[in-house]
Interface confidence: low
């Protein structure tokens, strides 16, 4: 069979599984005269043999872990032993079998983790090696937690990244670990090769002892600070502490105050920087943040509460320069004249704002002093000694002292003595007839004027008329304003009229005085009037129950999931048909009858959230009027975007030859949502074979450093694969490539002879 197992001398490559006893020849080389024999040289390791007639074979099992490629040379010799053909390269690639078990680098690992550490953030790595080929399942390792001791309520507090061996807290671990309850845990970790997927996989176990340390990054107790402090500022009021030294502290004012009177130093001590005024602001809530040297937050912010304690720094104030009350002639002793209500800006319901009232002077003192008294705490003025006569004294002036525990203020009250209220208001008409209005008549429209008269003393509370609707308008759609000079009442629309709920309203008005009627006089039918309001129908569009409907779903919901619903009603009671408008991404459909909204395509938060569409409600039948509302779909993030490089890194180079190991910094990102703390990526080399030449080390949650391990690099391009894990739930991993060129440099730039190649690197390291 010429060609497959035999043929002329030429460069060839053969693949042979390791660990197999020889069962057949590798190849039969055919000699061309004057060649008569063959010779084998190179990395034979006394395994590979060629017979003089050209038969190439091996005499015992290969071991890939000893040598993965055997570079041989075969030459054809003439009868005198002179090479007449070749030597040509013959490459034997040794294919891997799973003949090595994974082995942990340590039989016991020790680590510590702080309580409340972020779930998914690695605090310890276990590492196993397997001599088999990492490019095949034989060398692909799979880590698992076998046992967690102790196990409380069957809850796992720890998790392991199956691929990287990174141990981190679960969400429950982050919330529940407490060194006061349980300061240490033990994990048994297993590692399997074959990616953990085969019953024939080899495995190893290791023990991990974990100490739980206290998290001192805790919100301090709320602080109370007395206002108007005269002590020298700044004054330390509280403190926060990060778990390790070197944190950079700052305060965040979420309220965006024009004056933020707090500061923090690099020890974590928090100060008030100036005196506070409770009457300006009685409490502050702000946040303390700890960041690393790169400005990345180390943990969640802490909420700081400061309550400002009141001191009595405000005197009472009068409601107006002069407060005017009226009292009728012949009013009885003890009758209330009115209440003086003074104010105090100090804290309510405390001694600092508790007021006392006292009459300090009455003028004139006719027919005697002490005609009035004031309730000490309520401020209510009463007639104290006798009824008053207008013709004797038509007006009294009182000076009233209002005091809190430290301050006194004088307020002035004028009391006008007025005619007795012995006349009732009388309507000029008892029936104002019918009025027909369309239901869409504007709010604020005056629809009727009514008039009553009162024969008591003009421009006093005895003759002033107040109109009330006492029947026929339980919805409060109408109101009556009174002209104080003429006592004319203007009936005004205050709320929209509605044919559907009140087509006919039988309205009853009552006219009354602010002053009480004298004993024995009562309001009668003359003080009442009626009128009938007839509302005509206007076909109205449907009305949505909300201007904006909002729903929240996870971006990975299954197609066909109900994501929300809208409701509208037609005032005339017609059926409604719902539709969507502006569904530019084609994500949603609406049930025309029920208003339920469903997903019809995969949703994607990264494409934009909230997703805004309009919903339209249209009358079925009638004049098909419609109205529009908004539907906002808030998409909650799931970890569905693997990390990637933050920018294009083509053009990285080192000048060849390297005089010392070099390094470069690169940045990763992903499109998922990263709340306050930002992403927390972990970085590793993409394959085991890179570890001899390169090293990758994390700088912070987004940046890492790629360093050379030695200086012996060839003058060519190397493609370094980097594995970036986002530590999310589930963790996603991206493998990115950083092309790094080693090239001869001229004045710090890569030198290439003209026409050598395109895409010359442009960034030197």
């Amino acid at each position: 069979q010429e060609g497959k197992f035999s043929g002329p001398l030429k460069p060839m490559t053969f693949s042979i599984y390791e660990g197999q006893e020889p069962s057949q020849i590798i190849f039969q080389f055919k000699a061309n005269p004057p060649a008569v024999t063959f010779e084998l040289t190179g990395e034979t390791d006394n395994i590979f043999v060629i017979e003089r007639e050209g038969l190439l074979y091996y005499n015992r099992a290969l071991d890939r872990e000893t040598r993965s490629t055997h570079n041989l040379q075969v030459a054809a010799l003439d009868a005198n032993g002179i090479i007449v053909e070749g030597p040509v390269p013959i490459t034997i690639k040794v294919k891997d079998i799973n003949d090595n078990r994974p082995t942990f680098l340590q039989s016991k690992y020790e680590g510590s983790v702080r309580q409340n550490s972020r779930p998914g953030k690695p605090f310890l790595y276990v590492n196993a090696t397997d001599l088999d080929d990492p490019a095949t399942p034989n060398g692909q390792l799979y880590y698992q937690i076998v046992i967690q001791l102790p196990m409380i309520n069957n809850v796992m507090y720890f998790q392991i990244n199956n691929k990287t061996g990174a141990i981190s807290l679960t969400r429950e671990g982050s919330q529940e670990l407490n060194p006061a309850k349980n300061p240490s845990y033990n994990l048994v970790i297993s590692v399997k090769d074959m990616g953990g997927q085969s019953e024939n996989s080899f495995s190893d176990t290791t023990s991990v002892d974990i100490i739980v340390t206290e998290n001192i990054w805790k919100a301090p107790k709320p602080v109370e600070m007395v206002e108007n402090s005269t002590d020298p500022h700044p004054i330390k009021i509280t403190q926060v502490r990060w778990n390790d030294p070197g944190a950079q502290y700052s305060l965040v004012d979420k309220e965006k105050l024009p004056r933020f009177p707090f500061s923090i130093d690099q020890e974590g001590d928090i100060y008030v920087t100036q005196p506070l005024d409770r009457e300006e602001k009685d409490a502050y809530v702000f946040y303390a943040v700890a960041k690393d040297e790169y400005g990345k937050p180390l943990s969640y912010p802490l909420e700081i509460h400061v309550k400002v304690k009141d001191i009595n720094d405000n005197p009472p104030t009068c409601p107006s320069p002069v407060t005017v009350f009226e009292v009728q002639e012949n009013e009885r002793l003890g009758n209330s004249i009115g209440t003086l209500t003074a104010h105090d800006r100090d804290e309510e319901n405390t001694a600092n704002s508790f007021l006392n009232y006292r009459i300090v002077e009455q003028t004139p003192k006719l027919p005697m002093d002490g005609l009035f008294l004031i309730q000490t705490y309520a401020g209510m003025l009463q007639l104290a000694k006798q009824s008053l006569k207008k013709q004797d004294t038509p007006q009294y002036n009182l000076t009233i002292e209002v005091s809190d525990k430290d301050f006194k203020t004088l307020c002035f009250v004028q009391i006008n003595v007025i005619d007795i209220n012995d006349q009732i208001p009388i309507f000029e008409k008892s029936d104002y007839g019918n009025l027909t209005l369309a239901e869409d008549t504007n709010i604020g429209s005056t629809i009727l004027t009514i008039q009553a008269t009162d024969a008591d003393e003009p421009f006093t509370g005895s003759s002033k008329i107040l109109y009330h609707i006492i029947k026929g308008d339980s919805e409060g759609r109408l109101g009556v304003d009174t002209d104080p000079h003429t006592n004319t009442g203007y009936v005004i629309i205050k709320k929209p009229l509605d044919f559907e709920t009140a087509a006919v309203s039988n309205i009853v008005f009552k006219a009354e005085n602010p002053e009480p009627l004298v004993f024995g006089v009562k309001y009668n039918a003359s003080s009442f009037a009626k009128f009938t309001l007839i509302v005509t129908d206007v076909n109205e569009a449907p009305q949505f129950s909300q201007h904006v409907f909002q729903a929240k779903v996870s971006e990975d919901v299954a197609i066909g999931t109900k994501v929300g619903n809208v409701t509208a009603k037609d005032p005339e009671g017609l059926d409604i048909s719902y539709s969507l408008r502006g569904d530019t991404r084609g994500w949603l459909k609406i049930d025309h009858v029920t208003g339920e909204i469903f997903s019809v395509a995969p949703l994607d938060r990264e494409a934009g959230s909230p997703y805004r569409v309009q919903v339209v409600a249209t009358e079925v039948g009638g004049s098909s009027l419609s109205s529009v509302s908004e539907f906002h779909l808030i998409l909650m993030d799931v970890n569905d975007n693997p990390p990637r490089l933050a920018k294009d890194y083509t053009g990285l180079f080192f000048c060849h030859p390297l005089s010392a190991p070099g390094s470069l910094i690169f940045e990763a990102t992903d499109d998922d949502q990263h709340l306050f703390r930002g992403p927390h990526f972990t970085f590793s080399l993409g394959s085991g074979s890179l570890q001899n030449d390169w090293e990758v080390s994390k700088i912070n949650g987004t940046h890492a450093r790629l360093s050379t391990r030695h200086t012996e690099f060839e003058e060519r391009e190397y493609v370094v694969l980097i594995r970036i894990n986002d530590g999310g739930r589930p963790p996603l991993e991206g493998i990115v490539s950083l092309p790094v060129t080693f090239c001869s440099c001229v004045e710090g730039s890569c030198f290439r002879p003209a026409g050598h190649q395109t895409g010359i690197p442009t960034v030197g390291m």
């Epitope: 698992q144 937690i145 076998v146 046992i147 967690q148 001791l149 102790p150 196990m151 069957n154 796992m156 048994v188 297993s190 495995s203 176990t205």
Partner: nanobody, 114 residues
Amino acid sequence: EVQLVESGGGLVQPGGSLRLSCAASGLRFSSYAVGWYRQAPGKQRELVAQLTINGDTTYADSVKGRFTISRDNAKATVYLQMNSLRPEDTAVYYCNLGGSKGYRGQGTQVTVSS
């Protein structure tokens, strides 16, 4: 003292079913991964099925779709439901807790034969 007691083995015809049980005592059962191994005469011991504390299951290719492993933490018992049994399933079945370096029972004989 830790004890694992298997039961439920026996003679069954090809295509038949058996349910093996393994009752554990003397340890905190819920903290351990559980598994079933088998060993046929003259053959190496073989992992049949494993169930971790997280609920992850692993099955030998030869039993996938036929055998189901489950556990009842309240009863400290692990089960192996074996359906569509074949002659090549004949072996002594051992229950195991905590992986290869953990605890193993005495075994129960399963014979599939017509």
